[in-house]
Structures are given as C-alpha cells and as structure tokens.
C-alpha cells in the first residue's frame, strides 16, 4: 500500500511535471511566438485513456517529437533549452510511471496540435494531483 511519504513524493513529482508542461505551453502559445502557426501544423498522438500514472507511457513516447517541435521555437521569446527540458520531463515520467510493468499505450484515432497535446497532459496532471490531495 502507498505510504503518505510516497504519496507526497508522487504529488511533488506531478506538480513538477505540471509546471514544466505549463512552462512549455506558456512559452509557445502566445502572440510573441513567430513560429506558432508553423508549430500548429505538427501532429501529436493523444492517449485513448489517461487516468492512471501508467498512462504516462503515452507521454513518454511523444517526448522526442515534442523536442523536435520545440527546437523551432528557439527565439528571444522562448528561453528554455528543449533538450534539457525534455530530459527533465523524461526523468520525472519514468519515476512516476515506474518500470516494473510494461504498459502498451493505446492512442486515440484523432491526432492533436502541440497546444491540444500539452493541455491534455496538463489536465491529466491536475486530475491526478486532485485525487492525491
């Protein structure tokens, strides 16, 4: 059974992941981003279901495409280094989903823009955090 300390650790990791995802979204989805229109042409796979930590497998599998799109955003407006940012997210995702069980991610039929993709995972983090608090 999860202890209060492990629950707290999970909550902190989710909060960290949430802030990272929000930081990316804030950095690209604004009127100072000259590349936004181009970035919105890239398609991302969305999870068919995302209600448990194991479903973070679906996020992990899209981190490489995410990094590639973020590389387009490098400007005075976007102050994050995509490689470092995605690396940090990857570490948190691996810790959160655990490696004991292998989970095959199921994707929805419809693809999404980077903004829809990030918003979906932000909502996921917020939802799980609310169940922990």
């Amino acid at each position: 059974a999860p202890t209060s300390s492990s629950t707290k650790k999970t909550q902190l990791q989710l909060e960290h992941l949430l802030l990272d995802l929000q930081m990316i979204l804030n950095g690209i989805n604004n009127y100072k981003n000259p590349k936004l229109t181009r970035m919105l042409t890239f398609k991302f796979y969305m999870p068919k279901k995302a209600t448990e930590l194991k479903h973070l497998q679906c996020l992990e599998e899209e981190l490489k495409p995410l990094e590639e799109v973020l590389n387009l955003a490098q400007s005075k407006n976007f102050h994050l280094r995509p490689r470092d940012l995605i690396s940090n997210i990857n570490v948190i995702v691996l810790e959160l989903k655990g490696s004991e069980t292998t989970f095959m991610c199921e994707y929805a039929d419809e693809t999404a823009t980077i903004v829809e993709f990030l918003n979906r995972w932000i909502t996921f983090c917020q939802s799980i955090i609310s169940t922990l608090t």
Epitope: L25, N26, N30, Y31, N77
Partner: antibody, heavy 119, light 111 residues
Framework: QVQLVESGGGVVQPGRSLRLSCAAS????????IHWVRQAPGKGLEWVAV????????YYADSVKGRFTISRDNSKNTLYLQMNSLRAEDTAVYYC????????????WGQGTLVTVSS | DIVMTQTPLSSPVTLGQPASISCRSS???????????LNWLQQRPGQPPRLLIY???NRFSGVPDRFSGSGAGTDFTLKISRVEAEDVGVYYC????????FGQGTKVEIK
C-alpha cells in the same frame, strides 16, 4: 502624449461588412504591436486580434478567425480591422490597445467605437 | 484558453477603507522567460479600460500608490489601501502569458 482614436463603427446588418480604423499619435507607431479588444454592452472584455509592429505576424481569437482581418499602415500611423460576415454576437465597443513596452499586456487604450449588428 | 476567475464580483466599500480583489488563473502564468504577465485594469463608468498594474506588482505611470498588486503562479490580488470616490468602477485582471484573457470583472462601489 500617447493617443489612440478609433472610428468606423455603426449599425450594420448581419452578414455585412465594416472596417474600423485606429489612428495613433504621440509615440513611434511602427515600434509597437497593437491589439483589438472588444466589450459587448454590459459585459466583460474579450481579446480579438493582434498585429506585430512590422505587420509580419497576426493572430486572432477563435471567435473571429476567418471573418476578421487586422492590418496596419505604418506610414499613416493607422491600424485597421476589416470585419466580414458580421453576426449579432459581434455587437460591442471595439477598442484598439497598444502592447506594453518590454512586457505584455495593454498600456494605452483608445476611447472605443461601437459596432451594432442588427437587422 | 487560460480562464481567469475573479472574486468577489461586487465589492461595496466605505470611503477611506481598504478593498481587495482576488484573481485565480486555471494554469500557471509563469512564462519561459521567468516573467508572469498578469495585469490589472480599471474601467470607470463610461470610460475605456486603463492600466493600473503590470507583471503582478508594477504600478503603471500615474497610478496612485494606494493601488498594489501581489501574488504568484495562479493566485493574485489587487489591493486598494484606502478607497476614494474616483476608484468606483470595474476592475479586471488579465493574463498575457498566453493569448490574452480577462477575468469577469469586479464592481467596486461606495456603500
């Protein structure tokens, strides 16, 4: 002093078009991004569109995308909003607002021009 | 879109007394450049909006020092230390970290 003066508002039938203007003075117009923001009667504020200082980038709210076009003429210090396929829900006071210097948001606003869409 | 929620929606205040307005965003407003683009606007009756505070706590030029802003992340507050008659109107918080969105507005009136 910074001044923004809107014009071009009026009563128009649904489906028709209207062009708003915003004349700027008191600052270097070509150095600033400019926005249109609207306010329906008795309601709150809604961002409509923005155009970069050099006119190269334009973004729109989903509610007006494909119907409204923002443009500017830096030689005339004037901003425009071409509004096509107007709907009743576009009825509002339309304000032009200057983007902040070194930060984001709106530091100076015009007095507004009222657009009424009604049959 | 980021949703901005203000409380209260109406605030009857006695002249000379303090007033406080809260604003909460549906997501963090911290941008990748480290700035938080949260601003406060005042709209007096029959007037266009006017900027009071930008980037959480910076007073715009000509704004009296009785107005102050504070907060971080998703929770922000505008305070008027001593309400004067000319402060009557509607106050809006707005974010420009993403595409601009506004709170519903808080009507400040004299009791």
């Amino acid at each position: 002093q910074v001044q923004l003066v809107e014009s071009g508002g009026g009563v128009v039938q649904p489906g028709r078009s209207l062009r708003l203007s915003c004349a700027a003075s008191g600052f270097t117009f070509s150095s600033y991004d400019i926005h249109w923001v609207r306010q329906a009667p008795g309601k709150g504020l809604e961002w409509v569109a923005v155009i970069w200082n050099d006119g190269s980038i334009k973004y729109y709210a989903d509610s007006v995308k494909g119907r409204f076009t923002i443009s500017r003429d830096n030689s005339k210090n004037t901003l425009y909003l071409q509004m096509n396929s107007l709907r009743a829900e576009d009825t509002a006071v339309y304000y032009c607002a200057r983007d902040g210097e070194q930060w984001r948001g709106f530091d100076y606003w015009g007095q507004g021009t009222l657009v009424t869409v009604s049959s | 879109d980021i949703v901005m929620t203000q409380t209260p929606l109406s605030s009857p205040v006695t002249l000379g007394q303090p007033a406080s307005i809260s604003c909460r965003s549906s997501q963090s407003l911290v941008n990748s450049d480290g700035n938080t683009y949260l601003n406060w606007l005042q709209q007096r009756p029959g007037q266009p909006p006017r900027l009071l505070i930008y980037k959480i706590s910076n007073r715009f030029s000509g704004v009296p020092d009785r107005f102050s802003g504070s907060g971080a992340g998703t929770d922000f507050t505008l305070k008027i230390s001593r309400v004067e008659a000319e402060d009557v109107g509607v106050y809006y918080c707005m974010q420009a970290t993403q595409f601009p969105t506004f709170g519903q507005g808080t009507k400040v009136e004299i009791k």
